[in-house]
Amino acid sequence: MSVTACQGLGFVVSLIGFAGIIAATCMDQWSTQDLYNNPVTAVFNYQGLWRSCVRESSGFTECRGYFTLLGLPAMLQAVRALMIVGIVLGVIGILVSIFALKCIRIGSMDDSAKAKMTLTSGILFIISGICAIIGVSVFANMLVTNFWMSTANMYSGMGGMGGMVQTVQTRYTFGAALFVGWVAGGLTLIGGVMMCIACRGLTPDDSNFKAVSYHASGQNVAYRPGGFKASTGFGSNTRNKKIYDGGARTEDDEQSHPTKYDYV
C-alpha cells in the first residue's frame, strides 16, 4: 500500500471512529432497562452520560438531565472525563492530520515536517481511541457490578443499589452506546496506527538512515559522521561499522545473524 493511501485511509478510519466517539458520548442509551424478567414493560428506562430517559407505551418519551455534579457517582464522572478527553484529542488529531496529508500542499512544508505531523496525529488518535475504549469499558464494568448487586438485592428483598438512582424492580444492561463506543474507539485506534505506519514511509530518503559506508583505503574501518545523524533530529550515533567485503553497503543491508565473514 502506498504511503499516501495508508495515510489517507488512516485519516478516514480515524475520522469515522472519532465521529462514533462523539455519537456514543451524546447517546442516551449507555444503559437500558433489563427486560429479561419483565419483557412487557409499559415504561422503558434508559440512561446516558448526561441524562436519563423514559419511553412510554403511549409513545411519549421524556428525558431528565443530571443537573448535579456532586451527586453523581465518581465512576460516571470519570467516564465523562475520558470521553471528553478522547474527543478533544481527536479534534486536535484531525486538525494536525489535515495539514499532514501528503495529498494536500501547504506552502513549502517538506516531507519531514509532514512525517512528524502524521506521527503526532497518529499518536493523538491512538490515545483518543484508548480513552474511548477505557471509558466505555469502565461504564460497562459499573453496569455489570450494579446488575449483579440489584439481582442479589431482588432475591433478598432489599431493593436496587445502583450507581444511579434505581427503583426496586429496575435493572440495567448494556445499551447501544457501549457497542458504538467500543467500535468507534477501535476504529480511531486502528486509524492512528495506520497514520503512524504512514509516517515511516513519509520520512525523506536522506534521513532514514540508509547511510552509505565506503571502503576506506589503508584501513578497513569506515566511520559515519555523528553530525549527520544528529541533524535528522534523532540524536547522534558514532558507532563504528567494520567492512570486510569492500564496496559500499547500506545499513539496511546488514545482517543481524552471523555471516561467513564474521569469523575471519
Epitope: S57, G59, T167, T170
Partner: antibody, heavy 118, light 113 residues
Framework: EVQLLESGGGLVQPGGSLRLSCAAS????????MSWVRQAPGKGLEWVAT????????YYADSVKGRFTISRDNSKNTLYLQMNSLRAEDTAVYYC???????????WGQGTLVTVSS | DIVMTQSPDSLAVSLGERVTMNCKSS????????????LSWYQQKPGQPPKLLFY???TRESGVPDRFSGSGSGTDFTLTISSVQAEDVAVYYC?????????FGQGTKLEIK
C-alpha cells in the same frame, strides 16, 4: 373534537365470537397507542388489551390472552377487538381508550355492551 | 402483576368537606428514568365512561377543577378533594400505568350525606 365510537356489541352464546370496532376522529389516530378496557355490570374497571402506535406490539390481560386479538387499521382510523371463545365472565361494557403521557387514558368512548349468555 | 388496593371502599361526606382517598400498589410505580410515578386517577359518574383526573400521580389533566389534587410516591398515593361539591359524586379509580398488565384499584365510591 376527539371522539371514540364503539360498535359491534350484542348478545352472543358462550364459545361464540364477536368483533368490536372503534371509530376514531378528531385526532391523528396513527400517532396514538390505543387500548380496550371493560367493566362488568356493577363491577370495577379491567384493562383488556393495548396496541402500540405502529401496531407492532400488542399486550393482553391474562384473562383474555389467546382468545382476544387487538388490531388497528390506521387508514380507516379504526381500532378492533376480535373476541373468540367467549365466556359468561366476558359480559361487560367494552370501552375504547386513547393513551397519552404517563400511559394514562385521556379519552374514552361511550362503550358497547357485550352479553355472553345461553 | 401489580395489585392496586384502594381505601376506603366508600365514604359519605357533607358538601364543602375535605375528603381523602388512598391507593396502594404492591410494587413501586416510580420510574428511575424520569423520577415520575406511573399512576393515574379516574372519576366515573353513574352511567358515564371514566374521566381522567391525574396522570404521573399528581399532574392534573386539563379541565379538572383545582379542588382536586393528587400526591404520593412509590407505592402510596392519595387523591384529595379540598371542598366536595354535589357533582363530585362518583366512583374514583387509581390505575397502575407502570407495567403490563395495567391494573385498576377496586374503586372508592364517594357519596354525599
Amino acid at each position: 373534537e376527539v371522539q371514540l365510537l364503539e360498535s359491534g356489541g350484542g348478545l352472543v352464546q358462550p364459545g361464540g365470537s364477536l368483533r368490536l370496532s372503534c371509530a376514531a376522529s378528531g385526532f391523528t389516530f396513527s400517532s396514538y397507542t390505543m387500548s380496550w378496557v371493560r367493566q362488568a355490570p356493577g363491577k370495577g374497571l379491567e384493562w383488556v388489551a393495548t396496541i402500540i402506535i405502529g401496531g407492532s406490539y400488542t399486550y393482553y390481560a391474562d384473562s383474555v390472552k389467546g382468545r382476544f386479538t387487538i388490531s388497528r387499521d390506521n387508514s380507516k382510523n379504526t381500532l378492533y377487538l376480535q373476541m373468540n371463545s367467549l365466556r359468561a365472565e366476558d359480559t361487560a361494557v367494552y370501552y375504547c381508550t386513547r393513551l397519552v403521557k404517563g400511559n394514562a387514558m385521556d379519552y374514552w368512548g361511550q362503550g358497547t355492551l357485550v352479553t355472553v349468555s345461553s | 402483576d401489580i395489585v392496586m388496593t384502594q381505601s376506603p371502599d366508600s365514604l359519605a361526606v357533607s358538601l364543602g368537606e375535605r375528603v381523602t382517598m388512598n391507593c396502594k400498589s404492591s410494587q413501586s410505580l416510580l420510574s428511575s428514568g424520569n423520577q415520575k410515578n406511573y399512576l393515574s386517577w379516574y372519576q366515573q359518574k353513574p352511567g358515564q365512561p371514566p374521566k381522567l383526573l391525574f396522570y404521573w400521580a399528581s399532574t392534573r389533566e386539563s379541565g379538572v377543577p383545582d379542588r382536586f389534587s393528587g400526591s404520593g410516591s412509590g407505592t402510596d398515593f392519595t387523591l384529595t378533594i379540598s371542598s366536595v361539591q354535589a357533582e363530585d359524586v362518583a366512583v374514583y379509580y387509581c390505575q397502575n400505568d407502570y407495567s403490563y398488565p395495567f391494573t385498576f384499584g377496586q374503586g372508592t365510591k364517594l357519596e354525599i350525606k
